[in-house]
Amino acid sequence: SYSMEHFRWGKPVGKKRRPVKVYPNGAEDESAEAFPLEF
């Protein structure tokens, strides 16, 4: 269980997800751009 406070839907307060994946190479591209900064 998390030690930090929860919202009622179960996500820990302040836990930040990674950035959204980017697909810069058009419709044919299945692979996402790597992130320059990892969380």
Partner: antibody, heavy 113, light 112 residues
């Protein structure tokens, strides 16, 4: 061909509900981050919410408590359930594959009595 | 939620002009910023991601810069096809208390 096709838009009364669908082809929805975006007539783009590849969902303040994003992996389809609709929810709704040029054609939702 | 503020809202320019659009985030988003171009009745087109990287097929006259909270999109020499509306978009990670995906209000580039 990589493609997103939205459906389910239409005229709904204030307070009503609607479920939009976004059918994907050429890629697997569950492997990618998917965003719902809307655009009111003559206005700018507004992000509604995101479902990450792992199924985690997050919403803009304007959508929290009223809108729910889900997906059906077997149908390779994304959904936007919209409840307690208001006149200001009138817009073209797009589904988008992450940050990319993969946008659906949009579906118009009109909330009016 | 992250708020994105774009300026100007409308810009009048001529073919050949150098055009600069500014986008400000309400909190630091590192370089997780994209720029889109939209024409009437069409879905937006990705121009720039990661603040300064050109998406596939985008002409080199488009460039982006910035990090943290201040970003700019520059068109070095405006072409007839560039008259459109431009949007910045943050795509930073979301949390339960802050949604990280937001668009600026748009900048319409019109013919002077």
């Amino acid at each position: 061909e990589v493609q997103l096709v939205e459906s389910g838009g239409g005229l709904v009364q204030p307070g009503g509900s609607l479920r939009l669908s976004c059918a994907a082809s050429g890629f697997t929805v569950s492997k990618h981050d998917m965003i719902w975006v809307r655009q009111a007539p003559g206005k700018g783009l507004e992000s509604i919410g995101i479902i990450y590849d792992d199924g985690d969902t997050y919403y803009a303040n304007s959508a929290k408590g009223r809108f729910t994003i889900s997906r059906d992996n077997s149908k390779n389809t994304l959904y936007l359930q919209m409840n307690s609709l208001r006149a200001e929810d009138t817009a073209v709704y797009y589904c988008v594959k992450g940050v990319s040029n993969i946008w659906g054609q949009g579906t118009l939702v009109t909330v009016s009595s | 939620d992250i708020q994105m503020t774009q300026s100007p809202s409308t810009l009048s320019a001529s073919v050949g002009d150098r055009v600069t659009i500014t986008c400000r985030a309400s909190q630091s988003i590192s370089v997780y910023l994209a720029w889109y171009q939209q024409k009437p009745g069409k879905a937006p087109k990705l121009l720039i991601y990661q603040a300064s990287k050109l998406a596939s097929g985008v002409p080199s006259r488009f460039s982006g810069s910035g990090s943290g909270t201040e970003f700019t999109l520059t068109i070095s020499s405006l072409q007839p096809d560039d008259f459109a509306t431009y949007y910045c978009q943050s795509y930073d990670g979301s949390s339960s208390s802050s949604y990280g995906v937001g668009f600026g209000g748009g900048t319409k580039v019109e013919i002077k």
